[in-house]
C-alpha cells in the first residue's frame, strides 16, 4: 500500500479556493524528489496539472500551485477560481507519476445555491449554536414574530412568539425578543443536525406590512483533520468541543463500514479491548476540551474517528464532533521492538524502548499503564533516577545501547508485574511505544542467594550460577542505587575456553568484597549481557553488621539465609547446604565464604567468573 | 524524590494578589502533575489547583474559581499559583505538590512529593 496519504475526498463551490495537504513518509530520498497533482483521464493516464519542478498546466495557469514542506513531511496544492470543470478524480503523488506512490483524491465542485437577494449566510458546524437575526420595523413590534424553513414550495413553521415550537427542534430553540428600542428579534437553535441544513424565513407581523429577512444554515459535517503517524509510534487527538458541553460525558469512536461509530474510550469508563495497554483519555480543561493518546499504532488502528460530548457517553445526532482521519504509515521511523517481553516469577526482563535518535539527550521514562479511570500512567524510574519507592532495588533505566534505543530492566517479578507498560521521553512525544509483560511458568536461569548478611571489615564471596546456555555472554555483577547499576570491576575470567565443554553444572560468577564496609549494605545485580543488550538479572541483599563479640556460640562472618543444618568449617567458613538455596538443584555446589585470612593485594569489590568445579569442588 | 521549595507568600490585603511559586529541584518535573492545597489553622489540608504534565488541562477548587490561575514553566522547573481577588477565607499554608504521573486521571490522594509550604495572610 502507497505511504503517500491525503484527503479522500474534497468538495467545494464555484468560484471558491481549496487546499489540498498530502503527506509522504519524510525520508532523504522523498524529502528531495519531485511531487506532483495529476488528473486520472478516462484512459487510466494521469496528466499532470502542476509539479514541485515549476510545471503549471496551462488550466491552472495562475490559479494553483505546490508548495513542499520537506522538514514536515507533506506538499500542499492550492487551487483558485474553481469551476464544476474541475470535478474529478486526481492523484497527489512523488516520483513519477504511473510508479503508484501516490493517493487518490476526489473533487466536486458544486454550483452555490440560488439565493434571493439579501440572503443572510450562516455556515456553523453539526452540533454547534447558530443565532438567526431578524429585523423588523417598529409597527410590527407587537406583532407576531415566527421562523418558518422553506421546503420546496411550501414553509414550515419552526417557532413562533405565541410559543409554538416544531418537534423537531424540540429542547433546542429559543426565540428572544429584545427590549423596547430594538429592532431586531433572534432565534437561537442549539445542537444543528443536518437535517436543519437549508433556507428559513424570518417574519414580524402579517399582511402586505410584514417584515421578511431569508437566512441560508449550511450545517457542515467537521472536515477530518488528516493524521499521519507511524506504525508502532503514537497519536494524540485534541478535542475542543466548546464550553457549553463542559459538563457533559466525552467520548472518542471510530467510524466503522456501516457508518455507525464504536466507542474507543468514554469518560463513563467505557474501552474498547483492541486498544486496552495503549490509550489513556487525558482530563478536560475547564473549557471542556480534552486529548486522548493512543500508543503502540496497527495498521487497523487506521480510520475515521469522532471525539464528541453526550450524556450517554456515545454519537448522538445535534451534538457537537470533532473529526479525524488517521493514516498509519508502515515505513515506519520507529524500529521494531518486542510488544510483549515474558519473564518467570523470581525471574527479570530487559525491555528495549526506542526513541527519537536525534534526542538522545533528552529524558527517558517508564510507567505502569493503569485501566482505571479512563486510564494513567504512574512513572516507576526516569533516566534521573527511580521515582516510585516500591521498587527500589528490583528496577532500573539503563541508557544503553543508545543510539535510539534505552534498556529498563525489572527483576524479582511477580504476578503482580505483569501488565502494560509505557515507553516515553521528555522529546518527541510520536515515539511513545507500549510493551506487555507477562509473567510464564518457569525457573530463573541466574541463581543467587535469597539474602546475605556480612560482617564489617571481613571479605564476602557471592556466588551466581549460570546455566550453559549464557556461557558465550559477558557476566557483571553491579551495585544497585535508585540512579543505575553501576558495575563492580571484574577480575580476568581466565581462557575462553574454560566454558567451550559446558556440562550439566551450571557455572558460576562470583562477587567479592573486601574488606566488607558499611557503603557495601544495599542491593546488587548479577546479570548477563551481549555487548549493550542486557539479559537476565538475579538480585539479592547484602545487610552488613558489626562482629560479633568473643563467647558468642561461633562467629558468623557472612550468612546467606543459612538453612538449619548448616555446617561450620575449620576455617571459620560456613557452608550453605541445599535448603538455604532457592533451587537446592543448582545449589549443591554453592558457598558464601567469609575470609578472615590475609587478604593482602585483593581487590575491594571484585567479580570471578568460573565453573562450580574451579571453585574448589564439593562442598559435601 | 523531587524536593518543593514554596515562595511568595505573605501579608496581603483583602482585594489584593499574589504570586506563589514552587521551585523543584532533584529532577526535572516536565512529567509530573503539579499540584496547589492549603490549609488553614485547626482544618484539614484541601485541594486548590492542578496542572497537567504538558501545562494544556487545568483543574480548580470551586471556591478559587474564576480568582486563582496556576501556571507551569517546565524550562524553569517551576510551578506558580496567581492568586487574585484574595479573601480572609484564603489565609492558610499553601503547599506545593507533584505527583509523578505522566498522563491520565490523577486524583488529589496520588501527589506523592510535598513542599514545606509558604503562609498566605489575607487581612480585612
Known amino acids: 500500500k502507497s505511504p503517500v496519504f491525503g484527503p479522500q475526498e474534497v468538495s467545494s463551490v464555484e468560484g471558491n479556493s481549496v487546499s489540498i495537504k498530502c503527506y509522504y513518509p519524510p525520508t532523504s530520498v522523498n524529502r528531495h524528489t519531485r511531487k506532483y497533482w495529476c488528473r486520472k483521464g478516462a484512459s487510466g493516464r494521469c496528466i499532470t496539472l502542476v509539479s514541485s519542478e515549476g510545471y503549471v498546466s496551462s488550466n491552472y495557469a495562475g490559479r494553483a500551485n505546490l508548495t513542499n514542506f520537506p522538514e514536515n513531511g507533506t506538499f500542499v496544492v492550492n487551487i483558485a477560481q474553481l469551476s464544476r470543470d474541475d470535478s474529478g478524480h486526481y492523484k497527489c503523488g512523488l516520483g513519477i507519476n504511473s510508479r503508484g506512490l501516490s493517493f487518490d483524491v476526489s473533487l466536486e465542485v458544486s454550483q452555490g445555491p440560488e439565493l434571493p437577494n439579501g440572503t443572510e449566510v450562516y455556515t456553523v458546524d453539526v452540533g454547534r449554536t447558530v443565532t438567526i437575526k431578524c429585523p423588523f420595523k417598529t409597527e410590527n413590534a407587537p406583532k407576531t414574530k415566527a421562523l418558518y424553513k422553506k421546503i420546496g414550495q411550501t414553509s414550515v413553521l419552526v417557532i413562533d412568539s405565541r410559543n409554538y415550537v416544531n418537534p423537531n427542534y424540540k429542547d433546542r430553540i429559543r426565540l428572544r425578543i429584545p427590549g423596547t428600542g430594538q429592532l431586531i428579534f433572534t432565534v437561537v437553535i442549539d445542537r444543528l443536525r443536518l437535517s436543519d441544513h437549508g433556507l428559513y424565513l424570518c417574519q414580524a407581523g402579517d399582511g402586505s406590512n410584514r417584515d421578511e429577512k431569508n437566512a441560508d444554515l449550511q450545517v457542515l459535517e467537521p472536515e477530518p483533520e488528516l493524521v499521519y503517524e507511524d506504525l508502532r509510534g503514537s497519536v494524540t487527538f485534541h478535542c475542543a468541543l466548546g464550553l457549553e458541553v463542559a459538563n457533559v460525558a466525552k467520548f472518542l469512536c471510530r467510524v466503522n463500514s456501516r457508518e455507525t461509530c464504536d466507542v474507543v474510550i468514554n469518560t463513563l469508563g467505557k474501552r474498547d479491548s483492541a486498544f486496552e495497554g495503549r490509550i489513556l483519555l487525558n482530563p478536560q480543561d475547564k473549557d471542556g476540551s480534552f486529548s486522548v493518546v493512543i500508543t503502540g499504532l496497527r495498521k487497523e488502528d487506521e480510520g475515521r474517528y469522532l471525539c464528541g460530548a453526550h450524556s450517554d457517553g456515545q454519537l448522538q445526532e445535534g451534538w457537537p464532533i470533532q473529526a479525524w482521519q488517521l493514516f498509519v504509515n508502515e515505513e515506519s521511523t520507529i524500529p521494531r521492538s518486542p510488544t510483549v517481553v515474558k519473564g518467570v516469577a523470581g525471574g527479570s526482563v530487559a525491555v528495549l524502548c526506542p526513541y527519537n535518535p536525534k534526542e538522545s539527550q533528552s529524558l527517558k521514562y517508564w510507567c505502569l499503564w493503569e485501566g482505571a479511570q479512563n486510564g494513567r500512567c504512574p512513572l516507576l524510574v526516569e533516566s534521573q533516577g527511580l521515582v516510585q519507592e516500591q521498587y527500589e532495588g528490583r528496577l532500573s533505566l539503563l541508557q544503553e545501547p543508545g543510539n535510539g534505543t534505552f534498556t529498563v530492566i525489572l527483576n524479582q517479578l511477580t504476578t503482580q508485574d505483569a501488565g502494560f507498560y509505557w515507553c516515553l521521553t521528555n522529546g518527541d512525544t510520536r515515539w511513545r511505544t507500549t510493551v506487555e509483560i507477562k509473567i510464564i511458568e518457569g525457573e530463573p536461569n541466574l541463581k543467587v542467594p535469597g539474602n546475605v548478611t556480612a560482617v564489617l571489615g571481613e571479605t564476602l564471596n557471592i556466588p551466581c550460577h549460570f546455566p550453559c546456555k549464557f556461557s558465550s555472554y559477558e557476566k557483571y555483577w553491579c551495585k544497585w542505587s535508585n540512579t543505575g547499576c553501576q558495575t563492580l570491576p571484574s577480575q580476568d575470567e581466565g581462557p575462553s575456553e574454560a566454558f567451550v565443554n559446558c556440562d550439566e553444572n551450571s557455572r558460576l560468577v562470583s562477587l567479592t568484597l573486601n574488606p566488607v564496609t558499611r557503603a557495601d549494605e544495599g542491593w546488587y545485580w548479577c546479570g548477563v549481557k551481549q555487548g549493550h543488550f542486557y539479559g537476565e538479572t538475579a538480585a539479592v541483599y547484602v545487610a552488613v553488621e558489626e562482629k560479633k563479640v568473643a563467647g558468642s556460640r561461633y562467629v558468623s562472618p557472612a550468612k546467606a539465609d543459612a538453612a538449619p543444618d548448616e555446617k561450620v568449617l575449620d576455617s571459620g567458613v560456613r557452608e550453605i547446604e541445599n535448603k538455604a538455596i532457592q533451587d537446592p538443584r543448582l545449589f549443591a555446589e554453592e558457598k558464601v565464604v567469609a575470609d578472615t585470612g590475609d587478604q593482602a593485594g585483593g581487590s575491594r569489590a571484585s567479580v570471578d567468573s568460573s565453573s562450580s568445579e574451579e571453585q574448589g569442588g564439593s562442598s559435601k | 524524590q523531587v524536593q518543593l521549595v514554596e515562595s511568595g507568600g505573605g501579608l496581603v490585603q483583602a482585594g489584593g494578589s499574589l504570586r506563589l511559586s514552587c521551585a523543584a529541584s532533584g529532577r526535572t518535573i516536565n512529567t509530573y502533575v503539579m499540584g496547589w492545597f492549603r490549609q488553614a489553622p485547626g482544618k484539614e489540608r484541601e485541594f486548590v489547583a492542578r496542572i497537567d504534565w504538558s501545562g494544556s488541562s487545568t483543574d480548580y477548587a470551586d471556591s478559587v474559581k474564576g480568582r486563582f490561575t496556576i501556571s507551569r514553566d517546565n524550562a524553569k522547573n517551576t510551578v506558580y499559583l496567581q492568586m487574585n481577588s484574595l479573601k480572609p477565607e484564603d489565609t492558610a499554608v499553601y503547599y506545593c505538590?507533584?505527583?509523578?504521573?505522566?498522563?491520565?486521571?490523577?486524583?488529589?490522594?496520588?501527589?506523592?512529593?510535598w513542599g514545606q509550604g509558604t503562609l498566605v495572610t489575607v487581612s480585612s
Open positions: 505538590a507533584g505527583s509523578a504521573y505522566y498522563s491520565g486521571y490523577v486524583t488529589h490522594r496520588d501527589f506523592g512529593s
